[in-house]
Amino acid sequence: GITSINCSGDMWVEPGEIFQMGMNVSIYCQEALKHCRPRNLYFYKNGFKEEFDITRINRTTARIWYKGFSEPHAYMHCTAECPGHFQETLICGKDISSGHPPDAPSNLTCVIYEYSGNMTCTWNTGKPTYIDTKYIVHVKSLETEEEQQYLASSYVKISTDSLQGSRKYLVWVQAVNSLGMENSQQLHVHLDDIVIPSASIISRAETTNDTVPKTIVYWKSKTMIEKVFCEMRYKTTTNQTWSVKEFDANFTYVQQSEFYLEPDSKYVFQVRCQETGKRNWQPWSSPFVHQTSQETGKRNWQPWSSPFVHQTSQTVSQVTAKSSHEPQKMEMLSATIFRGHPASGNHQDIG
C-alpha cells in the first residue's frame, strides 16, 4: 500500500478511507504542483489507469466516482499531465478499504482444560469484516466487580492465576472496528463447572479366543477428577453408523470395556469424558483401530442383537453420519446419551 508518500496536493475519500462494502464512493484529487497547469488529472487503482466516471471539477481538482465499491482494499493514486513533461507527475495516493461492521460474537464458550492453567474462551466471529476488527474479551468478577479485558481474534487463553480472587465471573466479547461495535451475550461462568478432564486415551485392545470372542478395550486418563462420565463410540471402518456406550469411570486404574463385535472386522474406537453432571465434553480421542480375530465356529451373525453389546453397558445409542459427503458431521439419533446436555461443538468425527 501507499503508506508514506510525498504529496504535491491532496487526495480525499468520501465517505472516508474505510467505508461499508457496496457503498458509492467519491475520491477527490487536488493538485498543488509548482510550474504546472495540468492538462489532465488521472486516477489509478492498484496501478491501473481508470477510464470511466471521472469528472474535472476545476483547474486543480478532479473526482472519480465508484458505484457500489466492493473490493476489500485498493491502492489509489492520482497524477497530472503537465505541459512539457514526458511523464505524468504524481500528486498523491491513498489506501482505501471497504468492509462490514462486525456481527455480534456468538456461541461464546469458556472451558478450563485440566492441568492447562488457563481458561480458554472461544466464539464465532460471524461473517468476514474485511477490515481490522478487534475482539475484546471482558471478564468481570461477580464477587469483586473488578473487570479484566483481553485482546483477541477468535479465542483467548486467560491464566487461571489471574482468576484467583473469585470463582464466579461474567464473560462477554466486544467486537469493534471502524464501522461499528457489537457485544456478545454475557456468559455466567463458575470456574468449578467448566473443567474438562485431562485427555482420555485408548491404550490398547485385545480380542479373546473364547467361543464367543470378546474384545477388551483398555483406556486411561491422568485426570484427578473423581466422578467422570464417559462415552465410547465404535464402528467398523466400512460403516457410517457409530454405536455409543456409556460409562461411569474411575481413573485411579486403567479402564477395561468389553464388547462383542463382528469377527474379522476392522473397528474404530474413540472415547470422550466429562466431569459427571457438567456440560463440557472432551474432544473425542484419537481414533484407535482394532482388527477382531477370525470367527472360529460358524454361526448366524446378527450384529444388532445381543450379544453384540455386552450386557453391562449402561446405554447404547446409534450415531449416523448425515451423508457420505460430510463424514465429519455427525447427527445423534439417540439423545439419551447426552443426558440433557447439548452436543456442543466437540465432534471431531471420523466418517
Epitope: K134, I136, H138, V139, T144, E146, E147, Q148, Q149, Y150, L151, V156, I158, S159, S162, G165, Q174, V176, M181
Partner: nanobody
C-alpha cells in the same frame, strides 16, 4: 477508589525521547487493562497505546515503532516510552483503565503535557 497520576511530560526537541509514568491505586492493577490516550490542542481524545490484562500490547499507527507501553505490576505503574518524537506528538497525555476501543476505557488521570518543538 481508582486513582491515576501521570508524570514525565515536558518540552523536547523533534527526534528526542521522553518516558511517561502513570502511578495507579485503588484497584487490582496487575490484572487491569490500561491505555494511554492523548489530546492535541483544539482536538478530541485519541488513543495512543494499550496493554491488555494478559500483557498483549497494541499501538495506534501514528506511533507504531516509536512508542512502547509497559507495566510494572510490583510498582502499580504504567509507562510510555516515547522515542523519535515529532511535532505532531504534542498533546496532553492521559493514562486510563481499560482498552482503547468501544468505550472500554473508564477512568483517566489528570494528564501530563508533552510539547515537541524546536
Amino acid at each position: 477508589q481508582v486513582q491515576l497520576q501521570e508524570s514525565g511530560g515536558g518540552l523536547v526537541q523533534p527526534g528526542g525521547s521522553l518516558r511517561l509514568t502513570c502511578a495507579a491505586s485503588g484497584f487490582t492493577f496487575s490484572t487491569s487493562a490500561m491505555t494511554w490516550v492523548r489530546q492535541a490542542p483544539g482536538k478530541g481524545l485519541d488513543w495512543v497505546s494499550g496493554i491488555d490484562s494478559g500483557g498483549t500490547t497494541v499501538y495506534a499507527d501514528s506511533v507504531k515503532g516509536r512508542f512502547t507501553i509497559s507495566k510494572d505490576n510490583a510498582k502499580n505503574t504504567l509507562y510510555l516510552q516515547m522515542n523519535s518524537l515529532k511535532t505532531e506528538d504534542t498533546a496532553v497525555y492521559y493514562c486510563a483503565t481499560g482498552l482503547p476501543w468501544g468505550n472500554t476505557w473508564r477512568t483517566r488521570g489528570q494528564g501530563t503535557q508533552v510539547t515537541v518543538s524546536s
